[in-house]
Interface confidence: low
């Protein structure tokens, strides 16, 4: 399977909400011994590999934001976590996987990475990630709503496997 990032750049005004999205592509095994772990973290554009550095999002670690389930099942993080930190990660039955960030501030600007790990229990693991940039703007040049810029097809299906 692959992870696609439909948009590589999100430009948003301060105070707005944004939903960053990744999409799981390709065949997904729904066997009982296969689990998918999905999470989000902040990173920086590394010299060798994007998303190699893993930093918290608004002080929440990947462990706080992760989802786990089999196949294309739906899941989301606990509601009070989302309310307290203005964050919620979710996935649907179609392989879409997102994090919603509320009331954006300039400090939220940066590179965001989604990570999906497929674990075949006791046998193997396969991990892929996607990256996108969030720019939060203020002042007269800021857009009134979030503007999204589609990824090139090459970027959107860029994968990193274990």
């Amino acid at each position: 399977f692959k992870v696609a990032t439909p948009y590589s750049l999100y430009v948003c005004p301060e105070g707005q909400n944004v939903t960053l999205t990744c999409r799981l592509l390709g065949p997904v095994d729904k066997g009982h011994d296969v689990t998918f772990y999905k999470t989000w973290y902040r990173s920086s554009r590394g010299e060798v590999q994007t998303c190699s550095e893993r930093r918290p999002i608004r002080n929440l670690t990947f462990q706080d934001l992760h989802l786990h389930h089999g196949g294309h099942q739906a899941a989301n993080t606990s509601h009070d976590l989302a309310q307290r930190h203005g964050l919620e990660s979710a996935s649907d039955h179609h392989g879409n996987f997102s994090i919603t960030m509320r009331n954006l501030t300039l400090l939220d600007s940066g590179l965001y990475c989604c990570l999906v790990v497929e674990i075949r229990h006791h046998h193997s693991e396969h991990r892929v990630h996607g990256a996108m940039e969030l720019q939060v703007q203020t002042g007269k040049d800021a857009p009134s709503n979030c503007v999204v810029y589609p990824s090139s097809s090459q970027d959107s299906e860029n994968i990193t496997a274990a």
Epitope: Q63, H68, V117, I119, H122, E125
Partner: antibody, heavy 120, light 107 residues
Framework: QVQLVQSGAEVKKPGSSVKVSCKAS????????ISWVRQAPGQGLEWMGG????????NYAQKFQGRVTITADESTSTAYMELSSLRSEDTAVYYC?????????????WGQGTLVTVSS | DIQMTQSPSSLSASVGDRVTITCRAS??????LNWYQQKPGKAPKLLIY???SLQSGVPSRFSGSGSGTDFTLTISSLQPEDFATYYC?????????FGQGTKVEIK
């Protein structure tokens, strides 16, 4: 079958550090959260922190923040817990524990425990 | 942090008795609650995960129930090998926290 094998008992002086290892065998290592749980004599269980090796960064309980370091070496499937500035109340059995459900924290695999005694 | 409170802290029972241990979380943890059994000098053993799922290899006399903040571990008919200390543990979020334990002793 997954097995977690810990290093042997340690006797340490107050103010020093101890590093306990936990070697995993019988399954994949990188994607599973490994936690460290300690138990002082006659007391209950206390979670110190955990690490998911593929991320390489650990998550610590506030009580131990700044004094504990949890690391993992994917090449040897070994997790480590280092506790510094030891005091007598750190005398305890230290367990590593793991789940078979990946990044979850229900612990169905445990090491045999490592007794750390802090005494002057 | 989520506080876990177990009751009673100890109890005396006879072989064949039905035993109930309760665990209360300081806030909702959905069903992210596990139960462990520990015998002296041994590592804990997982009995129940996700509040009510029986861990593989654990006898069916052990059962768990509850969701939100209130949970129960029941041993339907106490056996000699069940005399031990039992702990609840939440894994809804880190830091992971345990109850203080319930020691089940022979009457």
């Amino acid at each position: 079958q997954v097995q977690l094998v810990q290093s042997g008992a340690e006797v340490k002086k107050p103010g020093s550090s101890v590093k306990v290892s936990c070697k995993a065998s019988g399954g994949t290592f990188s994607s599973y959260a490994i936690s460290w749980v300690r138990q002082a004599p006659g007391q209950g269980l206390e979670w110190m922190g955990g690490i998911i090796p593929i991320f390489g960064t650990a998550n610590y309980a506030q009580k131990f923040q700044g004094r504990v370091t949890i690391t993992a070496d994917e090449s040897t499937s070994t997790a480590y817990m280092e506790l510094s500035s030891l005091r007598s109340e750190d005398t305890a059995v230290y367990y590593c524990a793991r789940s078979s459900y990946g990044w979850s924290y229900e612990f169905d695999y445990w090491g045999q425990g490592t007794l750390v005694t802090v005494s002057s | 942090d989520i506080q876990m409170t177990q009751s009673p802290s100890s109890l005396s029972a006879s072989v064949g008795d039905r035993v109930t241990i309760t665990c209360r979380a300081s806030q909702s943890i959905r069903t992210d609650l596990n139960w462990y059994q520990q015998k002296p000098g041994k590592a804990p053993k997982l009995l129940i995960y996700s509040a009510s799922s029986l861990q593989s290899g654990v006898p069916s006399r052990f059962s768990g129930s509850g969701s939100g903040t209130d949970f129960t571990l029941t041993i339907s008919s106490l056996q000699p090998e069940d005399f031990a200390t039992y702990y609840c543990q939440q894994n809804e979020r880190t830091p992971i926290t345990f109850g203080q334990g319930t020691k089940v002793e022979i009457k």
